[in-house]
């Protein structure tokens, strides 16, 4: 069964800066990745970035830099201030559309006890939805 993992890290140098890393553990080819915050995409969450392996990357503030790390994992740096700034308990979700598995989404947030600059290892997060 395919799995999606999500890792959230707060940068030690800038407390309003977060790095989200997501990956897809499956054999299919990824056709689209959507990153959102505040909940799953299409379920109250706000889209931060969309990554298509052939069409490129689109992102919206407070996303600063979205990129493909490998052909099955992505990272997103968020930088914010004021209302657009993420906070420690913000939930981030990654949705991977793949063929032939379909869509798989998982969410994660900053581990409650983590110090700035630290994070939990990238373990698979609970699968919220498989379309």
């Amino acid at each position: 069964t395919p799995e999606v993992w999500v890792q959230v890290r707060m940068e030690a140098t800038e407390l309003s800066s977060f790095t989200i890393r997501c990956g897809f553990l499956g054999s299919g080819s990824i056709s689209l990745v959507t990153v959102s915050w505040g909940g799953p995409n299409g379920a109250g969450g706000t889209t931060l970035a969309v990554l298509h392996p052939e069409r490129g990357i689109r992102q919206w503030a407070p996303a600063r830099q979205a990129r493909w790390e490998t052909q099955s994992s992505i990272s997103l740096i968020l930088e914010g201030s004021g209302a657009s700034s993420p906070c420690a308990n913000t939930t981030f979700c990654c949705k991977f559309a793949s063929f032939p598995e379909g869509s798989w989404e998982a969410c994660g947030s900053l581990p409650p006890s983590s110090d700035p600059g630290l994070s939990a290892p990238p373990t698979p997060a609970p699968i919220l939805r498989a379309d």
Partner: antibody, heavy 114, light 113 residues
């Protein structure tokens, strides 16, 4: 099928503002972002910016930062672009296009003339 | 900003011939993570909005005839139209799909003799 409906033409006076609309149908409006593109004869296409419905932080081409304001109304599945302080060089065809420019509206011809 | 330069600005060919048009970018359009070049081609026929033809340098959009072929990498790209038809009369634009702002080339106008 996916459709992006735009008014055919707008005639406005120099120094005024105009709000162009782009009504989407045939898909979930909040699933794709809307791009705005300017076309002037002989000058090619220029990307103005994009906006994701529900995200209130549009991206702008710096060239249009003080000219265009992008908004959306999810209730009516409509995207808007307001152009201010209009001048003759703003006369052009303005297109909206969804997502990765997969679908385009027919364009609104904006004529700025006294 | 990435500057996209197309050549020639116009060309005229007879039906059945092959057409090759060039697009050069001022910076590489290669994405290191996917090893894909993020370049798209559009066709704009008179009185119509642009239509996506090719993305990712060489992937044809659904419904686009295989007479249209995209190639290239890095900063140099090419659109080839084999067996040109009368309905191919249009302006062809290349576009940087790599990074904001998503700049277009100046276009190549294809006329049919």
């Amino acid at each position: 099928q996916v459709q992006l409906q735009q008014p055919g033409a707008e005639l406005v006076k120099p120094g005024t503002s105009v709000k162009l609309s782009c009504k989407a149908s045939g898909y979930n409006f909040t699933s794709y972002w809307i791009n705005w593109v300017k076309l002037r004869p002989g000058q090619g296409l220029e990307w103005i910016g994009d906006i994701y419905p529900g995200n209130y932080s549009p991206n702008y081409n710096e060239k249009f930062l003080n000219k265009a304001t992008l908004t959306t109304d999810t209730a009516s599945s409509t995207a808007y672009m307001q152009l201010n302080n209009l001048a003759s060089e703003d006369s052009a065809v303005y297109y909206c296009a969804s997502g990765y420019f997969d679908y385009w509206g027919q364009g609104t011809t904006l004529i700025v003339s006294a | 900003d990435i500057v996209m330069t197309q050549s020639p600005s116009s060309l005229s060919v007879s039906a059945g011939e092959e057409v090759i048009m060039s697009c050069k970018s001022s910076q590489s359009l290669l994405n290191s993570g996917t090893q894909k070049n993020y370049l798209a081609w559009y066709q704009q026929k008179p009185g119509q909005p642009p239509k996506l033809l090719i993305y990712g340098t060489s992937t044809r959009e659904s419904g686009v005839p295989d007479r249209f072929t995209g190639s290239g990498s890095g900063t140099d790209f090419t659109l080839t139209i084999n067996n040109v038809q009368a309905e191919d009369l249009a302006i062809y634009y290349c576009q940087n799909d790599h990074s904001y702002p998503y700049t277009f080339g100046g276009g190549t106008k294809l006329e049919i003799k």
